[in-house]
Interface confidence: low
Amino acid sequence: DYKDDDDKGWMWNQFFVPEEMNKTDYHIGQLRSDLDNGNNSFQYKLLGAGAGSTFIIDERTGDIYAIEKLDREERSLYILRAQVIDSTTGRAVEPESEFVIRVSDINDNEPKFLDEPYEAIVPEMSPEGTLVIQVTATDADDPASGNNARLLYSLLQGQPYFSIEPTTGVIRISSKMDRELQDEYWVIIQAKDMIGLPGALSGTTSVLIKLSDVNDNKPIFKERLYRLTVSESAPTGTSIGRIMAYDNDIGENAEMDYSIEDDSQTFDIITNNETQEGIVILKKKVDFEHQNHYLIRANVKNRHVAEHLMEYHVEASTTFVRVQVEDEDEPPVFLLPYYLFEILEESPHGSFVGMVSATDPDQRKSPIRYSITRSKVFSIDDNGTIITTNPLDREISAWYNLSITATEKYNVQQISAVPVYVQVLNINDHAPEFSEYYDSYVCENAGSGQVIQTISAVDRDESVEDHHFYFNLSVEDTKNSSFIIIDNEDNTAVILTNRTGFSLQEEPVFYISVLIADNGIPSLTSTNTLTIHICDCDDYGSTQTCRDKDLLLSMGFRTE
């Protein structure tokens, strides 16, 4: 109670009323004027919100009562006005005055978690003390009223992995967790008011705590040895099989790279990023006959490993991959890419030309059969020996381009061909002859030693660098001696007159036999006739008219 400085004043309290009282006539307190001498002449009146409905006053005494249950959380403060009236005069004894009724709190509200549902993600293997999430409960009771709204948080479910700070609701890790054992935890938090003392109310919430993956597992091969096969005919780049490691981590932490530990020139491993399998690729063609299996060592490592997690990845997992090369039936292989043989023309039927050889590169070594495609001149036997079946004439064909096929006896589908070039070598089987037909003319009055014709020869045999023709007149013509021949020693010769004057009437035409020999071994000689016409020449010694007349005669005209 307190008294105003003024002599006249209210004696009154700031009143408190507990909420939720079951008694409807709860006595709050008493309003009293110090002018009231207790003789019941004063009348007390209550004005303002709640007066008469929620609160009443005993007009005689000034006692105030609450007549209905109050809820502090609905309304915690009532401001009322009081009057004191002299009942005898009906006049106010004091000026109207305000006072306050405060509804005092009782612990009638449990803590509530308003932000649920709670979900948190924390990396697995996080150390003790790592903050996960903070949960906050709200209590509608009065924080200023004792411990009614003072909350303490505790864990109903989640030990020993999590702990909660009792006053802040901060959830922390209290024990390392392995996502590979369990990837999420339901933690149940209880908030209790009254700092947990008897009579406290509580509320609970659930927190779903998910463990995010940390790269704490290395990939490990499922098998110690993988067996793969590859055909020797497989081209480079062929995928020959898959190997698989497993990693208990997920996502990026399970991404792995395979590699070949030995420096393999023949194989490579690439990672299939979808399946995380290792695909073994043929880097270089294999040959069953050279090497029929390979043993390679492969290892696997995670693609992304943070520095602080290296301890989990100290040793890479390794495995062996045995690649069996499958034999592919391959066609025969000739010893040489082509063959070049020589044979003399006019060699007899059955003459040896040369020998080809092919082998089966496969293990079973099939016998080989040979054949010559479309040839009437040569044949081949099963040993690869080529012989002639017809005479050869270099002057008809100096070269033969043959195709010889080798066929495996055990698998006639396996065929190889090789080009064979046969050169027919020259023998001296043709005598030289005039290179053209010569018609020669000489004037009747020709002098001795006059050149009347230069002759040359040809020979169908192969011309060699030092080939040489020798020119002579037949024995008869030499005796006759109207003409002589001089060999120029350059494969040409000149015919000269060997006398002065000829008679057109007596002997209009001379037929001279010219002998031409080559320098082959043995030498061949031919006899060639040279026709020499005697002409009636003009003063200038021209044989032209004689030639023209000859031309007309040859065309069927007569000349006189």
């Epitope: 293997m125 020993p160 992995y161 209290s174 024990s175 390392k176 967790m177 392995d178 054992l181 369990q182 704490d216 490990i220 091969f221 110690r224 301890e311 100290v314 040793e315 890479a316 997992s317 390794t318």
Partner: antibody, heavy 120, light 111 residues
């Protein structure tokens, strides 16, 4: 200091079963694996299997598959190892040993051992 | 026989340095951490070295571990009489999906 206290010695007849317990204290029981290792008289150590007390996940050595069962009770922080169809060669000292938070991390604490004698 | 191979016995005089070896394969020593245990007569094994070369607190620095490829070794320098015990190597085996122990090496301190 971590403590692993094992049950007392047992004498069993061939064909019977034995159940050995190992009570853990002074650490978070559910965070670590527990292994069982045995040692026959005058012989070396032989690993039998491993259990994670939190989920009850177990891995057994091939030799004991079908004959051994490992269980855990988180309320009492105790693990159990039961071996059935006993034969004389099962006579050994059986140890529990605390592992790490991963299967492949070392055993740091061992129980005092339980002698199991199998004799007719 | 054990997956991990240890020589059955080793000996040395006080003050000497002794090495105990442990040989395995790619799936165990080659891929995982090696641990060494000391077993004094009549007692449970005690962790001596873990993760190849780490010493738990309380283990003297006379003991050291190393690993290379598929074999590991334990070295004891300044040998003392109280070091007389059985020594076991142990490692997780990826292929067997389980722990494997060496057969054990009995260390005798002479004189």
């Amino acid at each position: 200091q971590v403590q692993l206290v094992q049950s007392g010695a047992e004498v069993k007849k061939p064909g019977a079963s034995v159940k050995v317990s190992c009570k853990a204290s002074r650490y978070t029981f559910t965070s670590y694996y527990m292994s069982w290792v045995r040692q026959a008289p005058g012989q070396g150590l032989e690993w039998m299997g491993i259990i994670h007390p939190s989920g009850g996940d177990t891995t057994y050595a091939q030799k004991f598959q079908g004959r051994v069962t490992m269980t855990g009770d988180t309320s009492t922080s105790t693990v159990y190892m039961e071996l059935s169809s006993l034969r004389s060669e099962d006579t050994a000292v059986y140890y529990c040993a605390r592992g790490g938070i991963k299967l492949w991390l070392h055993f740091d604490y061992w129980g005092q051992g339980t002698l199991v004698t199998v004799s007719s | 026989h054990s997956v991990l191979t240890q020589s059955p016995s080793a000996s040395g005089t006080p003050g000497q340095r002794v090495t105990i070896s442990c040989s395995g394969s790619r799936s165990n020593i080659g891929s995982n951490f090696v641990n060494w245990y000391q077993q004094l007569p009549g007692t449970a094994p005690k962790l001596l070295i873990y993760t190849n070369n780490q010493r738990p607190s309380g283990v003297p620095d006379r003991f050291s571990g190393s690993k290379s490829g598929t074999s590991a070794s334990l070295a004891i320098s300044g040998l003392q009489s109280e070091d007389e015990a059985d020594y076991y190597c142990a490692v997780w085996d990826d292929s067997l999906n389980g722990w494997v122990f060496g057969g054990g090496t009995k260390l005798t301190v002479l004189g």
